[in-house]
């Protein structure tokens, strides 16, 4: 059976299988029966990240400081710039086009996972035996105080928002 399609890194034009341009280069002219594909490197602040037949390179992403963005990884001729958010902020989407402040975990909830430049704070309810009495983006649920180890007794039970209150043992009891 004869060949009917071009090889992996080729494209078909005018019955001719031409080599695609490699990442970091754009197409200047298609090959012909008598000439090779002509490719040129992308310019400063441009990139192409795949084998391609594009006549224009893509512009690197701009990390706008006004949107809370900063450069995490500078782009090359083969890769786009990667943006991340300033301290205290995280991306609103995977493409990180803008930033919002990290959320705090309300009283009764603790931080399960601290936020990063690309992910928000993850909160979890404080389980029995633990509490959080602050609104925080960093604090985990803390364990209730153990009155026994201090030779005290529980005077007021703890909740998910409050610690137990310890007091002296009642000496009146027999």
């Amino acid at each position: 059976e004869p060949p009917t399609a071009c090889r992996e890194k080729q494209y078909l034009i005018n019955s001719q299988c031409c080599s695609l341009c490699q990442p970091g280069q754009k197409l200047v002219s298609d090959c012909t029966e008598f000439t090779e594909t002509e490719c040129l490197p992308c310019g400063e602040s441009e990139f192409l990240d795949t084998w391609n037949r594009e006549t224009r390179c893509h512009q690197h992403k701009y990390c706008d400081p006004n949107l809370g963005l900063r450069v995490q990884q500078k782009g090359t001729s083969e890769t786009d710039t990667i943006c991340t958010c300033e301290e205290g902020l995280h991306c609103t989407s995977e493409s990180c086009e803008s930033c919002v402040p990290h959320r705090s975990c309300l009283p009764g909830f603790g931080v399960k996972q601290i936020a990063t430049g690309v992910s928000d704070t993850i909160c979890e309810p404080c389980p029995v035996g633990f509490f959080s009495n602050v609104s925080s983006a960093f604090e985990k649920c803390r364990p209730w105080t153990s009155c026994e180890t201090k030779d005290l007794v529980v005077q007021q039970a703890g909740t998910n928002k409050t610690d137990v209150v310890c007091g002296p043992q009642d000496r009146q009891r027999a």
């Epitope: 059976e1 004869p2 060949p3 009917t4 071009c6 090889r7 992996e8 890194k9 080729q10 078909l12 019955s15 001719q16 299988c17 080599s19 695609l20 341009c21 490699q22 090779e36 594909t37 490719c39």
Partner: antibody, heavy 121, light 112 residues
Framework: QVQLVQSGTEVKKPGASVKVSCKAS????????MHWVRQAPGQGLEWMGW????????KYTQKFQGRVTLTRDASVSTAYIDLNRLRSDDTAVYYC??????????????WGQGSLVTVSS | QSALTQPASVSGSPGQSITISCTGT?????????VSWYQQHPGKAPKLMIY???RRPSGVSNRFSGSKSGNTASLTISGLQAEDEAEYYC???????????FGGGTKLTVLG
């Protein structure tokens, strides 16, 4: 312009191995398959196999299966042929040749200058 | 043994035309335009002269032409010149995932 420059003459003993290189320039190396063809003294052309310089995939003719290995180093645009368990009848000029395709046909448009391998005890 | 059959030798005088035949089967030469022709001078690498039966690469003289009839492809050289004296190989490309088959080669002698 497209050029395929091969390594020099080799003299080997029977049972030994030989590695011939083919350095490509003037085109996008991973974009075109590379074929290897040999020619024994006073004989015709004999196709041995091809390599896809992008993926490293290979195809060999039955006769050379298991004794020939085609490899490439895309970072230096070079294809290699390794022939082991050499015999005297492997004495030949070994050529690399670039494949060019159209919709219905492929052909070998550029050839290296050839590398003579002599197998003699 | 080659799957493509060529005459071992042909000859002609300067200025004459000669034709080299290449006979295959209905599954290669007969069915598809898969034949190419290569010229090889002694001690030199083969050079592509004709591909896809009758197409000429850039730089190849228009004295070289290709044709096909049934299961036989032919290379014709018109206005024969001394530098045309060489070995000529036909080649069938039997599909991208199969292999290349060469004819046995034809020695062209330019007389005189």
């Amino acid at each position: 312009q497209v050029q395929l420059v091969q390594s020099g003459t080799e003299v080997k003993k029977p049972g030994a191995s030989v590695k011939v290189s083919c350095k490509a320039s003037g085109y996008t190396f991973p974009g075109y398959y590379m074929h290897w063809v040999r020619q024994a003294p006073g004989q015709g052309l004999e196709w041995m196999g091809w390599i896809n310089p992008d993926s490293g995939g290979t195809k060999y003719t039955q006769k050379f299966q298991g004794r020939v290995t085609l490899t490439r180093d895309a970072s230096v645009s070079t294809a290699y042929i390794d022939l082991n368990r050499l015999r005297s009848d492997d004495t030949a000029v070994y050529y690399c040749a670039r494949e060019r395709c159209r919709t219905t046909n492929c052909y070998l448009d550029y050839w290296g200058q050839g590398s003579l391998v002599t197998v003699s005890s | 043994q080659s799957a493509l059959t060529q005459p071992a030798s042909v000859s002609g005088s300067p200025g004459q035309s000669i034709t080299i035949s290449c006979t295959g089967t209905s599954s290669d030469v007969g069915n598809y335009n898969l034949v190419s022709w290569y010229q090889q001078h002694p001690g030199k690498a083969p050079k592509l002269m004709i591909y896809e039966v009758n197409r000429r690469p850039s730089g190849v003289s228009n004295r070289f032409s290709g044709s096909k009839s049934g299961n036989t492809a032919s290379l014709t050289i018109s206005g024969l010149q001394a530098e045309d004296e060489a070995e000529y190989y036909c080649c069938s490309y039997a599909g991208r995932d199969t292999f290349v088959v060469f004819g046995g080669g034809t020695k062209l002698t330019v007389l005189g």
